[in-house]
């Protein structure tokens, strides 16, 4: 028997520095977690103690904090090189700055293979990107070899900016021939490493012949055997065992997100490459694990630029950006409109001629808007200003909801109106009319939504049974501010870009902004 230790991360999302327990900015260092310096300590400890160790990343290193905003992926390559990752799969967010923003900072700089078997380049890009990412890589580990085959969510064109010269194929269809190729090369221990979410991970384990282990990402899935060490609730045991169609027991793992945990899986193979046993658990990277001093020093060196960046002008406003709770929790506020407009703008993807865009709607809890921005400071808007408006380090995500769920959400928005509560919704691509004289749960008297399958966008009444795409904060997607119906009834949820980054990019693009209050949210009394 031969034993392999798989260390794995996924959806790190730019958390290079240690964070608080909820993966936001570290405030009290003695209670902070994660970060590459602490990760390195643990990885090195395991490398010294165990003979056959692989360190893998399942994608979405890109996007999530000011580190990515400033360094645009160079920080990912630099610190992953420093940690000596063995392989990485491409995630959807690796395409956030286009193919160019993947090639130059990451693919060019990485000293480890970057993988995806289901992304195929065509046209002029094919020769430019040839060899920069691979469908698979055979890695020597001790006296043996291990094949790593990569995959990426085929939804990436809807979630990011991969351009028109990359084709995202079905994961299972693309993986099988690559695994078969590895088998012909006499590689009998094969790990599928990828970024398509837990459901697809399980399908790959079930359907792709020859895959021994699946290491996934995208769905931020937390698996744990026994009593979990922090706040995350396990979606299943670690590893999650799937019985493949050909009768094998295939371990599937994921390690939550944000570098909070290091996935730790021990696999025992027989001489023919069959998995005999698998066990492990994610390791919580809490403050009991010291930060490696040399990596920490490097982080501090790179940090300097971030402080400079946060005070630079992004653009100007010529109007007061009303982000006060007195406005945003009671009525339409222009800060809400600005943020929603930025959210839609960030999700412009012309992937189908029938649609002007795949999504037109935005909702945003008024309680998530934490500060106004005064235009009388020469109109200057900085990252620092936006961090005061959006201080929670969330993301703006893409969900699919039925019209009936949206209707419930808007009823919830005003179910206890007047108490300055955070659930009052700001909107984009939606016209809503409330009648507060009616009883809670029956106050939405008009709800019109902007069409997507149209050449001239216009507002049509919401259809209860239709499925709509909506951009919203991850806080709402997770049922925050009492929006349990969104969490319970959403049909799909893909995590998006860092909230501040979305707004800062929009302001930089527009240069001068002047959002208005324009009748997106109205109140009426009496009949309609």
């Amino acid at each position: 028997a031969w034993e392999l230790t798989i260390l794995h991360t996924n959806d790190v999302h730019s958390r290079l520095e240690q964070t608080s327990e909820d993966s936001s900015k570290c405030v009290n260092a003695s209670r902070c977690m994660g970060g590459v310096a602490r990760l390195f300590t643990k990885v090195q400890q395991i490398r010294r103690a165990e003979p056959n160790v692989l360190l893998l990343d399942a994608g979405d290193q890109y996007q999530g904090t000011i580190w990515f905003t400033v360094y645009k992926g160079a920080e990912v390559a630099h610190f992953m090189n420093a940690l000596r990752y063995d392989a990485m799969a491409l995630g959807n967010h690796e395409f956030d700055n286009g193919v160019e923003g993947l090639i130059e900072p990451l693919l060019k700089e990485a000293k480890f293979p970057i993988l995806s078997a289901n992304i195929k380049a065509k046209g002029p890009l094919a020769s430019q990107i040839s060899g920069l990412y691979l469908p698979y890589k055979v890695l020597p580990v001790g006296d043996e070899v291990v094949g790593i085959v990569g995959y990426t969510s085929k939804e990436t064109p809807f979630l990011s900016n991969p351009g028109t010269n990359l084709v995202f194929e079905d994961e299972i269809t693309a993986l099988q021939p690559e695994v078969d190729k590895l088998k012909t090369l006499n590689v009998n221990k094969i790990i599928a490493l990828g970024h398509s979410g837990f459901e697809m991970d399980k399908l790959i384990a079930q359907k792709v012949r020859g895959v021994d282990v699946v290491v996934g990402g995208h769905s931020n899935t937390f698996l744990y055997t026994g009593n979990p060490p922090s706040k995350e609730v396990p979606a299943g045991k670690y590893p999650f065992i799937v019985t493949s169609d050909d009768g094998r027991k295939v371990p599937v793992v994921q390690a939550y997100a944000f570098g909070k945990y290091l996935g730790y899986l021990k696999i025992e193979f027989d001489e023919r490459g069959n998995v005999i046993s698998s066990h492990g658990n994610p390791i919580l990277l809490n403050s009991s694990i010291p930060e490696d001093p040399s990596i920490k020093a490097d982080i501090n060196k790179w940090r300097i630029k971030l402080d400079n960046y946060s005070t630079q002008e992004l653009g100007k406003t010529i109007v007061y950006l009303d982000g006060s709770s007195q406005s945003c929790r009671f009525r339409e506020c222009n800060m809400g409109n600005l943020i929603c407009d930025a959210m839609i703008n960030n999700n412009l993807r012309h992937t189908d001629e029938m649609f002007w865009n795949h999504v037109s709607m935005c909702i945003l809890n008024g309680g998530g808007i934490r500060s106004p921005i005064d235009e009388r400071n020469n109109g200057t808007i900085t990252w620092e200003n936006l961090a005061a408006v959006l201080p929670f380090g969330g993301t703006f995500d893409l969900v699919q909801l039925k019209g009936s769920t949206l209707k419930k959400a808007f009823e919830h928005s005003v179910h206890r109106y007047g108490q300055s509560t955070g659930e009052f919704l700001q909107v984009g691509g939606i016209h809503v009319v409330y009648d507060l004289s009616r009883k809670p749960g029956d106050r939405v008297v008009k709800l019109d939504v902007l069409c997507t399958k149209c050449r001239v966008p216009s507002y049509d009444p919401l259809k209860m049974d239709e499925v709509y795409k909506v951009i919203l904060p991850n806080f709402l997607a997770n049922g925050g501010d009492g929006f349990q119906m969104i969490k319970d009834e959403l049909l799909r949820h893909d995590s998006g870009d860092q909230d501040i980054n979305v707004v800062s990019t929009y302001i930089s693009k527009m240069k001068v902004i002047y959002p208005a209050v324009e009748g997106r949210i109205k109140f009426s009394t009496g009949s309609h």
Epitope: K72, E75, K108, G131, K301
Partner: antibody, heavy 123, light 108 residues
């Protein structure tokens, strides 16, 4: 306007020393790797040395290793090349060049070049 | 070190001609190749990076192709201002930068 201006060239005897400077303007100097490239009279281009944006990675051509030292002062937007133990074969126009990629640690293409400064090593 | 070999070392052409210069690397360098133009007494100017990407401000008559070891710079219709010396340069990861010996494009 993005600009690189070299200075410090001149006539020096074999075994002597010279310090070249390159003043940068019009771009955020400390975002980019910088390089020295030279061109002997009537000959082609030869890369001499490079330094990454935060001075962590420094490289030299074998022909100058141990004799030349590249450095940068990001607060002054200036790149330097300290040349010691100069030889006749070091005679060339020395160009300062900027890497086109931000924060790179590995080799890149050079999108901005200075006008060059002539170094003549002769007795 | 990786050697870069350009051919031809010089060529004569007329305004309006299609001109092709090739560059061969002694080992695989992926797409990490740049092309520069240099006029007498002037600094080189970047034309193409990553084998085929046109630097901003460079006329579209210049194009690059190739990957691996064999690369080509094409000027689709030679203009009077294009008479110069052209250099290729490899910048493959973690190996020193090396230039080709140059190709001089002269008026026929």
């Amino acid at each position: 306007e993005v600009q690189l201006v070299e200075s410090g060239g001149g006539l020096v005897q074999p075994g002597g020393s010279l310090r070249l400077s390159c003043a940068a303007s019009g771009f955020t100097f400390d975002d980019y790797a910088m390089h020295w490239v030279r061109q002997a009279p009537g000959k082609g281009l030869e890369w001499v040395s490079g330094i990454n944006w935060n001075s962590d990675n420094i490289d030299y051509a074998d022909s100058v290793k141990g004799r030349f030292t590249i450095s940068r002062d990001n607060s002054k937007n200036t790149l330097y090349l300290q040349m010691n133990s100069l030889r006749a074969e070091d005679t060339a126009v020395y160009y300062c060049a900027k890497d086109r990629r931000k924060y790179s640690n590995s080799p890149g293409a050079f999108d901005i070049w200075g006008q060059g400064t002539l170094v003549t090593v002769s007795s | 070190d990786i050697q870069m070999t350009q051919s031809p070392s010089s060529l004569s052409a007329s305004v309006g001609d299609r001109v092709t210069i090739t560059c061969r690397a002694s080992q695989i360098i992926g797409p990490w190749l740049a092309w520069y133009q240099q006029k007498p007494g002037k600094a080189p100017k970047l034309l193409i990076y990553r084998a085929s990407s046109l630097e901003s401000g460079v006329p579209s008559r210049f194009s690059g192709s190739g990957s691996g070891t064999d690369f080509t710079l094409t000027i689709s219709s030679l203009q009077p201002e294009d008479f110069a010396t052209y250099y290729c340069q490899q910048y493959n990861s973690y190996s020193p930068w090396t230039f080709g010996q140059g190709t001089k494009v002269e008026i026929k």
